[in-house]
């Protein structure tokens, strides 16, 4: 279930997945929530003088049992991911951090009158993930009232330092506040030849688009369908970027589908989850557990309730069916996507809905309205 | 709600509190906004108090303590209790409330989607019940709206648990075999909602149960899809265009 409590002066021992820098425990928790395997985190708000490089360290952790041994550590804050917390799941982070320099690759320096303008500038720039603003009292005159737009490979700062008269924060694209606009176009039989930042295996272009939307550096994508000639690239979703922020003109390519990240959308941003169940499709991955249930949707629900489960397979083979139902195989992988997708199985596959929000569109099929 | 947790503001924006104002004002039942001028609830909420004038309806709230004399409330223009509902039997436990003035939809107050008649056999897996009712059988009304996720129980299985009552196709049951999570007193009339195809639907209206959250005693809800003809007939015959199909 959902566990929101934070443990002060507590550090989880072991289970390390990744370490990043975040300005506070809340942002660390958010990063853990969106990491495919992270269940627990420990954040170092205060460190001894010898370990200043560990201050603001966010240590993302996993555990087979869902818990890890706790050790006392002054200045540490630990907690759980919010993967099963429905309504509380949001990539949006509006907090501003006074006296912090969130470091990264500075790709633009502009003069702005205030922090709000600087944050808006970041929100309206394709590449900007976070920013630092130097106030008029900053010790170096040439940087005063300057807004530094930044990015990094992980989307989080490469380090964080305390510094007087600097203020830092994050882009508000994930709060649906960007004014860039979002092209919804899907280009059938087209590929973008731009820089690949990552690749994952997905069952369709829509899942590919959602993954691109929530990837820190993906601006557009190309997905190769199951009919693609190169076997090793079938069902592969290439996450892409470019210096300009726009893709080069699409190249005609049979069995390729391309499109844009929806990060800069204001209304049509997808949820960070995929609810569709794919019939006749086998999602391969590491097996977590096997249960017997009645129906693929119950299998999906079981996967959703099992916090480590990322995707599932529901088999309808007679030998996989008992009186209490058919085989529901709960699975996971390092990146949250299947390691391979094959077709023609007797059954269906789908994803966990653990990152789905509980809010919804008001578009009903049947409506009661006053004339 | 037994075994639930606090809801967040705007999480269940269709939930309303039905309150009776006699000497003092008390929360008695829940209800669901289904249109600007319409709330769907349980007929049994009005047993002994079928007088529209004494009811006050509050939407867009999370805590009952938010309600003061200044809090705007809706009044009942017309109370439509299902014509087949008999106090002595408890079937057809459904009622429509037409409000005197249309509601303004906000982030915190908006309607829930209704199922279609065709949804009568839909299998729902992600269902929640909400309300300000008791958190135990001998409890008290809660200040903060509670929510709980609860699995649906097939009618045949539900019938075995309630051999003294007829669990008919106009009812739908929900609960865990081991108990522990359920609606309770004060949650009546409120929603049982399920997320289906990415959309929340009003699947049930909290109706009754043997005690609250007892082992092998699921909650019983009025099955909304079975009453769609009635809902549409009543809302249309009351000078309202009811059916609107969206390109969802």
């Amino acid at each position: 279930g959902c566990m929101t409590q934070l443990y002060k002066n507590t550090f989880f021992r072991g289970g390390d997945l990744a370490a990043i820098y975040t300005p506070d425990a809340q942002y660390c928790q958010k990063m853990c929530t969106f990491h495919p395997r992270c269940l627990l985190f420990s954040f170092l708000a205060v460190t001894p003088p010898k370990e200043t490089n560990k201050r603001f360290g966010c240590f993302m952790k996993e555990s087979i049992t869902g818990t890890l041994p706790r050790i006392h550590r002054t200045g540490a804050i630990s907690g759980h991911s919010l993967k099963q917390c429905g309504h509380q799941i949001s990539a949006c982070h509006r907090d501003i951090y006074k006296g912090l320099d969130m470091r990264g690759s500075n790709f633009n320096i502009s003069k702005t009158d205030n922090i709000e303008e600087c944050q808006k500038l970041c929100t309206n720039n394709f590449h900007c993930q976070f920013f630092t603003y130097a106030t008029s009292a900053f010790y170096r005159p040439e940087y005063r009232k300057k807004c530094l737009l930044k990015h990094s490979a992980s989307g989080t700062p490469t380090s964080i330092k305390s510094a007087d008269n600097l203020v830092s924060g994050f882009s508000l694209k994930s709060c649906a506040l960007s004014e860039i606009g979002c092209p919804m176009d899907i280009f059938q039989h087209s590929a973008f030849a731009d820089l690949n930042v990552s690749q994952v295996i997905t069952p369709d272009a829509f899942v590919c688009r959602t993954i691109c939307t929530f990837h820190p550096n993906c601006l557009f994508f190309t997905f190769y369908t199951n009919e693609w000639e190169t076997e090793s690239q079938r069902n592969v979703c290439f996450l892409k970027t470019s210096k300009s922020g726009r893709p080069s003109p699409p190249i005609p390519q049979e069995n390729a589908i391309s499109g844009y990240s929806l990060l800069t959308c204001r209304k049509t941003r997808p949820e960070p989850c995929h609810s569709k169940i794919y019939s006749g499709v086998d999602f391969e991955g590491e097996e977590l557990n096997v249960t017997f249930v009645q129906g693929a949707d119950v299998c999906q629900e079981t996967c959703t309730k099992t916090i480590r489960c990322q995707f599932f397979i529901y088999s309808l083979l007679p030998q996989d069916c008992k009186e209490e139902g058919c085989k529901c195989s709960l699975r996971l992988s390092t990146d949250g996507s299947p390691t391979r997708i094959t077709y023609g199985m007797q059954g269906s596959s789908g994803y966990s809905l653990r990152l789905c929000k509980l809010v919804d569109s008001p578009d009903c099929t049947t409506k009661i309205n006053a004339r | 709600i037994v075994g639930g947790t606090n809801a967040s503001l705007g999480e269940w924006p269709w939930q309303v509190s039905l309150q009776v104002k006699l000497v003092s004002q008390t929360h008695l039942c829940g209800g669901s906004i289904i249109g600007r001028q319409w709330v769907l609830t349980a007929a049994h909420c009005f047993d002994g108090i079928p007088y529209p004038d004494v009811w006050r309806i509050y939407g867009g709230i999370l805590s009952l303590s938010e309600i003061t004399k200044e809090t705007p409330s809706s009044r009942i223009k017309e109370l439509i209790i299902h014509q087949e509902y008999k106090v002595s039997e408890g079937n057809y436990d459904i009622a429509l409330i037409k409000l005197q003035t249309p509601l303004n939809y906000t982030e915190f107050q908006k309607p829930i989607c209704l199922p279609s008649k065709a949804d009568t056999n839909t299998i729902y897996t992600n269902c929640w019940v909400t309300g300000w009712g008791y958190t135990k059988e001998q409890g008290e009304t809660q200040n903060i709206l509670q929510k709980a996720t609860i699995p649906l129980v097939p009618n045949e299985e539900c019938q075995k648990k309630y051999r003294d009552y007829v669990i008919n196709k106009q009812m739908i049951c929900a609960g865990y075999k081991e108990g522990g999570t359920d609606a309770c007193k004060g949650d009546s009339g409120g929603p049982l909602v399920c997320k289906h195809s990415g959309r929340w639907q009003l699947v049930g209206i909290t109706s009754w149960g043997e005690g609250c959250a007892r082992k092998d005693q699921p909650g019983v809800y009025t099955k909304v899809s079975e009453y769609m003809d009635w809902i549409l007939e009543k809302t249309q015959s009351s000078d309202v265009r009811a059916l609107e199909t969206s390109s969802a």
Epitope: - | H44, D47, S88, E89, G133, D164, T206
Partner: antibody
Framework: EVQLLESGGGLVQPGGSLRLSCAAS????????MTWVRQAPGKGLEWVSY????????IYADSVKGRFTISRDNSKNTLYLQMNSLRAEDTAVYYC??????????????????WGQGTLVTVSS | DIQMTQSPSFLSASVGDRVTITCRAS??????LAWYQQKPGKAPKLLIY???TLQSGVPSRFSGSGSGTEFTLTISSLQPEDFATYYC?????????FGGGTKVEIK
């Protein structure tokens, strides 16, 4: 209008038998639980027995168990109470009543919403 | 068996008086309680069920409250037709049991 009319009461010797009937009208008899309640002269009310709508389930008070049998004929809209091995302490006015099972405060709740006028049974030698 | 204890057994009151009758259960019965009124030579009449729900057609001067083991029947302003005997009944578990009755007489 709901009506319940008892008959079959009278004077009977200890150890004797009597069969009470209750004719129901004005409602769908087969939908309802039915019950018998008795009241000894100058005393309070005592519940005797109940029967489910189909007649498949019956329950009795300890004081009459093994001696009284409740039954019903839904085709005739009639409830019966067969009383055997009668004792002096069985002397009472016997009422049949309809058991309503509505919903209140989210619970199913039973109550006796309509009663017959009663029939007097006197057990005396 | 659940014992139902009613008090007082007798009550003398005048027209217009506020009258309260108490019923105590020997163990918790939730809200599974009904109140009946009986006049001499007549069958009992249902007033209140589920501890507090007024039966249709019963005047609103009658009200019920309580839950668990303590219950009350209140007549806010006694009318001439209210002089009768009142019984509480638990419907929580078999055998169903009645209280001993409260006779409300004219003072």
């Amino acid at each position: 209008e709901v009506q319940l009319l008892e008959s079959g009461g009278g004077l009977v010797q200890p150890g004797g038998s009597l069969r009470l009937s209750c004719a129901a009208s004005g409602f769908t008899f087969s939908h309802y639980l039915m019950t018998w309640v008795r009241q000894a002269p100058g005393k309070g009310l005592e519940w005797v027995s109940y029967i489910s709508p189909s007649g498949g389930h019956t329950i009795y008070a300890d004081s009459v168990k093994g001696r009284f049998t409740i039954s019903r004929d839904n085709s005739k809209n009639t409830l019966y109470l067969q009383m055997n091995s009668l004792r002096a302490e069985d002397t009472a006015v016997y009422y049949c009543a309809r058991v309503a099972r509505g919903i209140a405060a989210r619970s199913r709740t039973s109550y006796f919403d309509y009663w017959g006028q009663g029939t007097l049974v006197t057990v005396s030698s | 068996d659940i014992q139902m204890t009613q008090s007082p057994s007798f009550l003398s009151a005048s027209v217009g008086d506020r009258v309260t009758i108490t019923c105590r259960a020997s163990q918790g019965i939730s809200s599974y309680l009904a109140w009946y009124q009986q006049k001499p030579g007549k069958a009992p009449k249902l007033l209140i069920y589920a501890a507090s729900t007024l039966q249709s057609g019963v005047p609103s001067r009658f009200s019920g409250s309580g839950s668990g083991t303590e219950f009350t029947l209140t007549i806010s302003s006694l009318q001439p037709e209210d002089f009768a005997t009142y019984y509480c009944q638990q419907l929580n578990s078999y055998p169903l049991t009645f209280g001993g009755g409260t006779k409300v007489e004219i003072k």
